[in-house]
């Protein structure tokens, strides 16, 4: 056990050790009790032993010698196993276009040297995924850079120089994908001091959404080292993690096509924005049209949604249907319509915060309603809720992760529908996953346009 | 609804104790850092106490500091000020308000109690 | 005494442009951005303004802050009977163990 000496050197090392875990691997220190040995000795090893095989040590459950360099290692102060503070936003920014600011800057560098770094950061991932970045000077950006020391405004100090070189916090309002630069570090453009480049990469990687890697080649591994910036590229794993976020460059999937042409049903990158049944036929959305799939027949035919429903609007997001009622319920950013009997109800559109979202729901990403239970379910994020539609009211122990309940699916759907008495139909990009909810797993995997014969 | 409701205040002795809640309701209670500021009569604002979205991170004010305790439950969505040897001073109306960060500052506040 | 020094009171007739001005040092203004909080008589205070100028959702343009060096100063253009309240400026501040700082509050008067 790691409390076997009461030299002060050793004493020095577990409390030092103590702190490390408490930061960035979740060990309750109000849970060790010094004087109960054993106790506290065994809830330390175990973290000894995660962070161990997180970073890719021996794993010893001892704070042996490269367990304390490692500890000692300059790094970013995001935990590696829990998140730094997860933001109401989710786990993903939910548009392509994404501004940041720089609020300060540091003494180290010249302004234009950190503006190109910064700028060269937003790059790396801009080149992977489809995102988009445009510095902006004034007003609130999504992202904001700031140099700052010590207690800077965020309940999360700096500690002085080496140690935590920089944190970044999760997309969402706020403080969310903001991104903070320790000012007791020596910011360079070299291998001298820190790398403002390569520190940047990383946070931004944050500020996107992305966890720590236990991957040593990872530009997302949570300790700083130095690698040649005119020859740094993303890991594989970097790229898997923020392309499995938002897809890649060519995947533009969640923006409207540019010119609003009609998409290629079989094309084999189809995703859609929404789907739901409407009695014995299928209505798949995407942008201002829809296709009408009648259940068992070939044949399917693409609509302008306005031809159908004038008053509604495109790029409906989310939809379900309560059969019994004859009701579909369409859902686009924080409103939805009522349809009855395939019209649009008066009185609409109402505000999703009726149906007793909180207010950092701003939008439904996918809804589908089971008749065996009668409830609706709600997909935000990575994160769904659960409204029962006799009570007309959520149920309560919601919001919950999609990843822990529907194995296999998520973290984040575009859409989903019910059919044959036992089958979710979940989307998610140009993949289709059917769901037997009494079984409680995937059954089968297809393209999403699979409906269509393609 | 963002909500803050607080609740436990009362009259008491000096050198007696209290102990506020604040319940949340509406918003992901755990992602956000909480407060308290007291208000006495007649009088301005003042910063009591905070603590991080964890818990694992708090700070006082030098007037309270050694005599008040701040903590949260996140599975109850509920703040607390555990308030000691309590003096005529501390005489105020208590305010739990969400948020806290220097940039964002506190955006949403309970009524009072 | 406060860390912050805001006018006691200030008053406008409606329609008018009134300011507030709030000072303060380098461990404070001089290094933090300042948020404005608006108590409207036997409520809650509320967010008016935060980071120096920026305005929440649903409080009205005619709500501006700005900031410079270690001052700050809340502008209330188009003043309206229903803005007569207690204003008060805060910020964190490096050199206290406890990070916020609030001004003393000054009061609106809307003649």
């Known amino acids: 056990l790691p409390l076997n000496s009461s030299t002060s050197l050793e004493k020095n090392n577990v409390l030092f050790g103590e702190r490390y875990l408490e930061k960035f691997y979740g060990l309750e220190i109000n849970k060790l009790p010094v004087t109960k040995m054993k106790y506290s000795g065994n809830l330390m090893k175990e973290k000894i032993q995660e962070m161990q095989h997180f970073l890719g040590l021996k794993v010893t459950g001892q704070l042996d010698t490269s367990t304390l360099e490692m500890m000692h290692a300059p790094r970013c102060g995001v935990p590696d196993v829990h998140h730094f503070r997860e933001m109401p936003g989710g786990p993903v920014w939910r548009k392509h276009y994404i501004t940041y600011r720089i609020n300060n800057y540091t003494p180290d560098m010249n302004r234009e040297d950190v503006d190109y770094a910064i700028r060269k950061a937003f790059q790396v991932w801009s080149n992977v995924t489809p995102l988009k970045f445009s510095k902006i000077n004034t007003g609130m950006a999504d992202i904001l850079v700031v140099f700052a020391r010590g207690a800077h405004g965020d309940f999360h100090a700096f500690d002085g120089k080496g140690g935590i070189l920089a944190h970044a916090f999760g997309p969402g309002s706020g403080i969310g994908g903001d991104a903070h630069f320790d000012e007791d570090e020596f910011w360079t453009t070299h291998s001298g001091g820190t790398n403002l480049f390569l520190t940047a990469v990383h946070e931004i990687g944050h500020s996107l959404g992305l966890g720590h890697s236990s991957d040593p080649k990872a530009v997302m591994f949570p300790t700083y080292k130095y690698v040649d910036i005119n020859t740094f590229r993303l890991s594989a794993d970097d790229i898997r993690g923020i392309q499995s976020l938002y897809g890649d460059p060519k995947e533009n999937q969640r923006l409207p096509n540019p010119d609003n042409s009609e998409p290629a049903l079989c094309d084999p990158n189809l995703s859609f924005d929404a789907v739901t049944t409407v009695g014995n036929k299928i209505f798949f959305f995407k942008d201002r049209f829809f296709w009408l799939k009648v259940s068992e027949r070939p044949k399917t035919s693409v609509n302008l949604i306005s031809s159908l429903w004038p008053t509604l609007p495109s790029g409906i997001e989310a939809a379900y249907e309560i059969e019994a009622r004859n009701q579909v319920f369409l859902f686009k950013d924080d409103k939805y319509w009522l349809i009855s009997n395939l019209r649009p109800e008066p009185n609409y559109p109402k505000s999703i915060h009726s149906f007793g979202f909180p207010n950092f729901v701003k939008k439904i990403d996918a809804a589908v309603f089971n008749p065996r239970f009668y409830r609706t379910y709600f997909f935000v994020d990575n994160q769904y809720w659960r409204y029962d539609e006799r009570r007309q009211m959520m149920d309560p122990g919601y919001p919950k992760l999609i990843t822990k309940n529907f194995q296999g699916i998520g973290p984040k759907i575009d859409a989903v529908f019910y059919s044959k008495n036992k089958y979710y139909y979940f989307f998610q990009g140009s993949n289709q996953f059917e769901y037997d909810f009494l079984l409680q797993r995937i059954t089968k995997t297809l393209k999403s346009n699979s409906w269509f014969g393609c | 609804e963002v909500q803050l409701l607080e609740s436990g205040g009362g009259l008491v002795q000096p050198g007696g104790s209290l102990r506020l809640s604040c319940a949340a309701s509406?918003?992901?209670?755990?992602?956000?850092?909480m407060q308290w500021v007291r208000q006495a009569p007649g009088k301005g604002l003042e910063w009591v106490s905070g603590?991080?979205?964890?818990?694992?991170?708090?700070m006082y004010a030098d007037s309270v500091k050694g005599r008040f305790t701040i903590s949260r439950d996140n599975s109850k969505n509920t703040l607390y000020l555990q308030m000691n040897s309590l003096r005529a001073e501390d005489m105020a109306v208590y305010y739990c308000?969400?948020?806290?960060?220097?940039?964002?500052?506190?955006?949403?506040w309970g009524q009072g109690t | 005494q406060s860390a912050l020094t805001q006018p006691p009171s200030t008053s406008g007739t409606p329609g008018q442009r009134v300011t507030i001005s709030c000072s303060g040092s380098?461990?404070?203004?001089?290094?933090?951005?300042v948020n404005w909080y608006q108590q409207l008589p036997g409520a809650a205070p509320k967010l008016l303004i935060y980071s120096n100028d920026l305005r929440p959702s649903g409080v009205p343009d005619r709500f501006s802050g700005s900031k410079s060096g270690t001052s700050a100063s809340l502008a209330i253009s188009g003043l309206q009977s229903e803005d007569e309240a207690d204003y008060y400026c805060a910020a964190w501040d490096y050199s206290l163990n406890g990070p916020w700082v609030f001004g003393g509050g000054t009061k609106l008067t809307v003649l």
């Open positions: 308000a969400r948020g806290g960060d220097s940039l964002y500052g506190m955006d949403v």
């Open positions: 509406g918003f992901t209670f755990s992602v956000y850092p």
């Open positions: 380098g461990s404070n203004i001089g290094s933090n951005p």
């Open positions: 603590i991080s979205s964890s818990g694992g991170f708090t």
